[in-house]
């Protein structure tokens, strides 16, 4: 019985977990999904029983080997995965566990621009970046376009501060999961600056 | 890659006993089981047995247990199968072939097959 | 030992037509059949294993069914080089057995 073994997956894709063993005589194998059955493989006889027959399209077994393929990957087969070997050989069975973490392929990142003032002509304001639908485990960069890949700041809010007659730089920022990484259209702070500054005037005219 | 390598022909007195060989290479020898399958010219396959190079042991099909010999060699990764006092009937093509994990009397990787014919 | 039934000694068929072979059991193997696929001058290859497992890089026209004693492995959209004979095995328990083999042929 080894570690956890971490696995990463996306949806409608396909993950394998790993499975090897040198026991000769193998009588089953049981696979569990968050303690439900899943498979059980007797190898002499060669029968494979999957549990649930919407999962038989599913499960593949890669070489003919005992390593476990699951493919057509949805959210919620995020959890954890237990193997057991069971042999007469062997005093009790060997063991391993895993656990699978699914995740969507990011959408397009919106960027939302907070509470602005402008002060002597400085505009200051916070661009914050996020996803429509609430993914999980997303980590946010922001770039300054034509700086090469030069991140220059970590987090989903920027701060940014921005003099009149200044020279204007895209912005845009990055969101990236395990699987998959997006970018947000480009936002130059002049125009935002500028387009806020007319919405302000409109309103008080 | 896998590869299971075989002698491409043998020509066998009748009475003479005659050892084929099967070079495994590519994969773990002594993991899987290594089966011996005869092929009649013009006819279909028939299991003659199995061995395990780990232990040798033997799974024979009663029909070949006075006829063949499954033997093996770990340190060449090599498979063997002895025919004893052959007869016309053994001229045959016969194949070594690997089991696989999942399903261990299912075979995977196939050599060429060994041509013997018996002929005085 | 048990006896695998291949009832078709031959079919013909034309390319990009759905064929299948049945092959029966003489007991329960449940699902511990194999379908192989041999052409001439060639080894036999494995295509099928636990009656329904597609083997590693086998193309997906290439189907296997059923349980117990009766065993259907199906080719969807023949192609020439599909030409060939195919044999059942039952690998659920020794002596391993095969059955007589189908050949498929063009029209």
């Known amino acids: 019985s080894g570690p956890v073994k971490e696995l990463v997956g996306s949806v409608g894709g396909a993950v394998t977990f790993p499975l090897k063993s040198k026991v000769k005589q193998v009588d089953s194998i049981v696979w569990t999904f968050n303690t439900t059955p899943l498979v059980t493989i007797q190898p002499e006889g060669g029968t494979i029983i999957v549990t649930q027959n919407r999962n038989r399209e599913r499960v593949d077994f890669p070489d003919g080997g005992y390593s476990l393929k699951l493919s057509k990957l949805k959210k919620n087969d995020s959890g954890i995965y237990y193997v057991g070997i069971y042999s007469s050989s062997l005093q009790q069975p060997s063991t391993q566990e895993y656990v699978l973490h699914v995740y969507e392929h990011l959408s397009k990142p919106k960027v939302t621009m907070g509470l602005q003032s402008n002060k002597n002509g400085t505009c200051v304001t916070n661009l914050t970046c996020c996803m429509e639908h609430g993914e999980e485990d997303v980590i946010y960069t922001w770039k300054a376009l034509g700086q090469g890949d030069n991140q220059f700041h970590d987090g989903a809010t920027l701060s940014i501060a921005w003099r009149s007659g200044e020279k204007d730089q895209a912005l845009t920022c990055m969101a990236r999961n395990p699987v998959s990484n997006s970018f947000s259209t480009p936002v130059f702070p002049q125009k935002l600056c500028e387009d806020a500054a007319t919405d302000l005037t409109s309103l008080r005219g | 890659q896998v590869q299971l390598q075989q002698p491409g022909a043998e020509l066998v007195r009748p009475g003479a006993s005659v050892k084929l060989s099967c070079k495994a290479s590519?994969?773990?020898?002594?993991?899987?089981?290594m089966n011996w399958v005869k092929q009649r010219p013009g006819q279909g396959l028939e299991w003659i047995g199995m061995i395990h190079p780990s232990d040798s042991e033997t799974r024979l099909n009663q029909k070949f247990k006075d006829k063949a010999t499954l033997t093996v060699d770990k340190s060449s990764s090599t498979a063997y199968m002895q025919l004893s006092s052959p007869t016309s009937e053994d001229s045959a093509v016969y194949y070594c072939?690997?089991?696989?994990?999942?399903?261990?009397?299912?075979?995977?990787?196939w050599g060429q097959g060994t041509s013997v014919t018996v002929s005085s | 030992d048990i006896v695998m039934t291949q009832s078709q000694k031959s079919m013909s068929t034309s390319v990009g037509d759905r064929v299948s072979i049945t092959c029966k059991a003489s007991q329960d193997v449940i699902t511990g059949v194999a379908w192989y696929q041999q052409k001439p001058g060639q080894s036999p290859k494995l295509l099928i294993y636990s009656a329904s497992y597609r083997y590693t890089g086998v193309p997906d026209r290439f189907t296997g069914s059923g349980s117990g004693t009766d065993f259907t492995f199906t080719i969807s959209n023949v192609q020439a080089e599909d030409l060939a004979v195919y044999y059942c095995?039952?690998?659920?328990?020794?002596?391993?057995?095969f059955g007589a083999g189908t050949k498929l042929e063009l029209k």
């Open positions: 095995q039952q690998h659920y328990s020794t002596p391993l057995t």
């Open positions: 072939a690997r089991s696989t994990m999942i399903a261990t009397r299912a075979m995977d990787y």
């Open positions: 590519g994969y773990s020898f002594t993991t899987y089981w």
